[in-house]
């Protein structure tokens, strides 16, 4: 029994005065607590606790389940204990079958003995299977058997506590060890979409998936630079051992422009943290922005092909697209497709394929697109470059030689005189009059130029060349002159094609 110096409060004394007491099943347990300030007896075994306010604890017919620690406490909070074993050959173990071990920690298999004098108190595998080679344990008859440094590999290990009684091995009920994993990596987090674009009033919902070894992982949605509590819901699954998945869904039922911003899904465990973000942009109404991929003024040579290409952003998604020329809608020759197959794509491409363009096909080509909120359009001015064509070449009544040529860009007309029968004319002749005429065709059609020279300047037989040219090519027409006495005659004018 403990002894203390006089004057100080002392712990209660217990009779019988020993730390351990062994009684047989069916016998009486009689414990007396002596203390002037007696408060209570407490009995503890496994997770069970009982109290008794009498200073004498009497159990008339002891059972194995009366095995445990009996503690007497006084008003000063001082206590004294005795451990009672109720020996029952038919019930050698008291058991609490719940067995949860934290990875890398020790865990107790709770199978205290009712008889401390049995031997070889240890653990055995179920159905004669051996225990893992690295499993170490320490037996304690009053508490159970402590497994040291639990490994993840022990998860769902089937065990028995075992003793030898009269030369025979006796097993307890079976225990299944459940290992709660230690976190040895940060959680794995992912988000359903990296960015969202919504109109005011639409619902914003984004899901974060958190994967870890157990449900103890912490996760939350946060708004960057804000402390506001967000409304989120979650769901979770156990996909077998050490494979836990949680889906945390953040919802804003009616998004506003000022809800725009960056939202972070944050997860952490005892090892560390991880996060992933998503961006929300809320617009007051939809939009369409068109970006021409080529210059909106296009020059193309006669007979060649050209592709008119636009990219455009449309939100919500485009509903109607069309290409128009001269108030006519193209039914074919164009294609429209999303820039990417990404679910959040808002960028599209439209291409109009113009093939073997004729000089008469210049003009304004318009792309129109609309969605439920807005319409937008872009125009391309297409100019078809054509080699000059000499429309008329005449000697006028007033003696002027006149040449009229059409082409695009605007042709230049030069005049040359060749003496005699030479076809190579080099001496240039200055025109008397040059005019650009208004074309009766479309505004993007050929430009018509008229040039005149005075034929009275020519005193000898020869050929006059009218040469019309531009960036695309050149064409010539010829006037042949022959003098008969003092009379000048124009002989058949003719043209010569020059590629």
């Amino acid at each position: 029994q403990p002894s203390v110096s006089p004057g100080e409060p002392s712990p209660p004394s217990i009779h019988p005065g020993k730390s351990d007491l062994i009684v047989r099943v069916g016998d009486e347990i009689r414990l007396l607590c002596t203390d002037p300030g007696f408060v209570k007896w407490t009995f503890e075994i496994l997770d069970e606790t009982n109290e008794n306010k009498q200073n004498e604890w009497i159990t008339e017919k002891a059972e194995a389940t009366n095995t445990g620690k009996y503690t007497c406490t006084n008003k000063h909070g001082l206590s004294n204990s005795i451990y009672v074993f109720v020996r029952d050959p038919a019930k050698l173990f008291l058991v609490d079958r719940s067995l949860y071990g934290k990875e890398d920690n020790d865990t107790l298999v709770r199978c205290p003995l009712t008889d401390p004098e049995v031997t070889n108190y240890s653990l055995k595998g179920c159905q004669g299977k051996p225990l893992p080679k690295d499993l170490r344990f320490i037996p304690d008859p009053k508490a159970g058997i402590m497994i040291k440094s639990v490994k993840r590999a022990y998860h769902r290990l089937c065990l028995h506590c075992s003793v030898d009684q009269e030369g025979k091995s006796v097993l307890s009920e079976k225990f299944i060890l459940k290992v709660r994993p230690a976190f040895k990596a940060v959680p794995v987090v992912s988000v359903s979409k990296a960015s969202y674009l919504l109109r005011e009033g639409e619902e914003f919902t984004v899901t974060c998936t958190i994967k870890d070894v157990s449900s103890s992982v912490y996760s939350t949605w946060k708004r960057e630079n804000s402390q506001t509590k967000l409304q989120e819901k979650y769901n979770s699954w156990h996909h077998g051992d050490f494979n836990y998945e949680r889906q945390a869904t953040l919802t804003i039922s009616s998004a506003r422009v000022n809800d725009s911003g960056v939202f972070m899904c944050y997860a952490n465990n005892t090892f560390g943290s991880a996060n992933v973000t998503t961006t929300l942009e809320v617009v007051d109404k939809g939009f369409i922005n068109i970006f021409p991929m080529i210059n909106t003024t296009v020059f193309v040579n006669d007979g060649e092909n050209v592709d008119l290409i636009v990219e455009y952003e449309a939100f919500p998604k485009p509903e109607h697209q069309q290409w128009i020329y001269m108030n006519r809608t193209f039914t074919d020759k164009w294609e429209d497709y999303p820039k990417s197959e990404n679910e959040s794509n808002i960028r599209y491409v439209s291409e109009l394929h113009l093939t073997r363009l004729k000089g008469t096909e210049g003009g304004t080509y318009t792309f129109l697109v609309s969605n439920s909120d807005v319409n937008a359009a872009i125009a391309f001015n297409v100019y078809v470059n054509t080699k000059p064509e000499i429309l008329t070449y005449d000697r006028l009544v007033n003696g002027m030689l006149q040449c009229v040529a059409a082409g695009f860009p605007e042709p230049t007309i030069d005049w040359y005189f060749c003496p005699g029968t030479e076809q190579r004319c080099s001496a240039s002749v200055l025109p008397v009059d040059v005019q650009t005429l208004n074309s009766s065709g479309p505004p993007f059609g050929k430009l018509v130029v008229q040039s005149s020279i005075d034929s009275s300047a020519f005193k000898h037989n020869g050929t006059v060349e009218c040469k019309a040219y531009n960036d695309v090519g050149k064409t010539s027409a010829y006037f042949n002159f022959a003098f008969k006495g003092n009379n000048k005659e124009q002989i058949h004018p003719h043209t010569l094609f020059t590629p």
Partner: antibody
């Protein structure tokens, strides 16, 4: 010994809302998940949802989505369950229960239950 | 959602009888299965958790077994205070679901 103490019985009209509280006495439950389970007269148990300290939100059974909100006030060790747009079939005893046993610490068995709150919906 | 089917829905037995109640899950729930006892006008009480673990203070005549989809609650020797309704509940994934209950009555 932790106990869950719920607010008293309520009588509500259809279309109204009810807010039931569940307070931990004799301890705290800031580190425990709390579920709400209801039982209509003569019927079985029906899980409504859970509020979990390891998640920034709650999990609600599909049947109650949009009508139920569960919140927690750690300073007073109280959780709340609000059910809106009440109808006669919501007449039931509503229990809060602590997830306190089992391998999954936050999703384990209900080891402590409140005494229940009878909510009667009647016009 | 995981459906929990309990059988029988009601059962008459006498004191001292051995009684077995079964619970079947619509998909594998490992051993995340709990059993509760409920008496009229009272809150449910946890008996067994994780299929086979006896809750503290619950008499050892109650035992649970099973894994995967099939589970059993056994009362080895019925006592008068055991006449009540028993529910199983899965904790493998949300939404958590209960069986329909088994009402145990005195024969």
């Amino acid at each position: 010994q932790v106990q869950l103490v719920q607010s008293g019985a309520e009588v509500k009209k259809p279309g109204a809302s009810v807010k039931v509280s569940c307070k931990a006495s004799g301890g705290t439950f800031s580190s425990y998940a709390i579920s709400w389970v209801r039982q209509a007269p003569g019927q079985g148990l029906e899980w409504m949802g859970v509020i979990n300290p390891t998640v920034g939100g709650a999990n609600y059974a599909q049947k109650f989505q949009g009508r139920v909100t569960m919140t927690r006030d750690t300073s007073t060790s109280t959780v709340y369950m609000e059910l809106s747009s009440l109808r006669s079939e919501d007449t039931a005893v509503y229990y809060c229960a602590r997830h306190g046993r089992g391998y999954n610490e936050y999703e384990g068995a209900f080891d402590i239950w409140g005494q229940g709150t009878l909510v009667t919906v009647s016009s | 959602d995981i459906q929990m089917t309990q059988s029988p829905s009601s059962l008459s037995a006498s004191v001292g009888d051995r009684v077995t109640i079964t619970c079947q899950a619509s998909q594998d729930i490992s051993d995340y299965l709990n059993w509760y006892q409920q008496k009229p006008g009272k809150a449910p009480k946890l008996l067994i958790y994780d299929a086979s673990n006896l809750e503290t203070g619950v008499p050892s005549r109650f035992s649970g077994s099973g894994s995967g989809t099939d589970f059993t609650l056994t009362i080895s020797s019925l006592q008068p205070e055991d006449f009540a309704t028993y529910y199983c509940q899965q904790g493998n994934s949300f939404p958590l679901t209960f069986g329909g209950g088994t009402k145990l009555e005195i024969k």
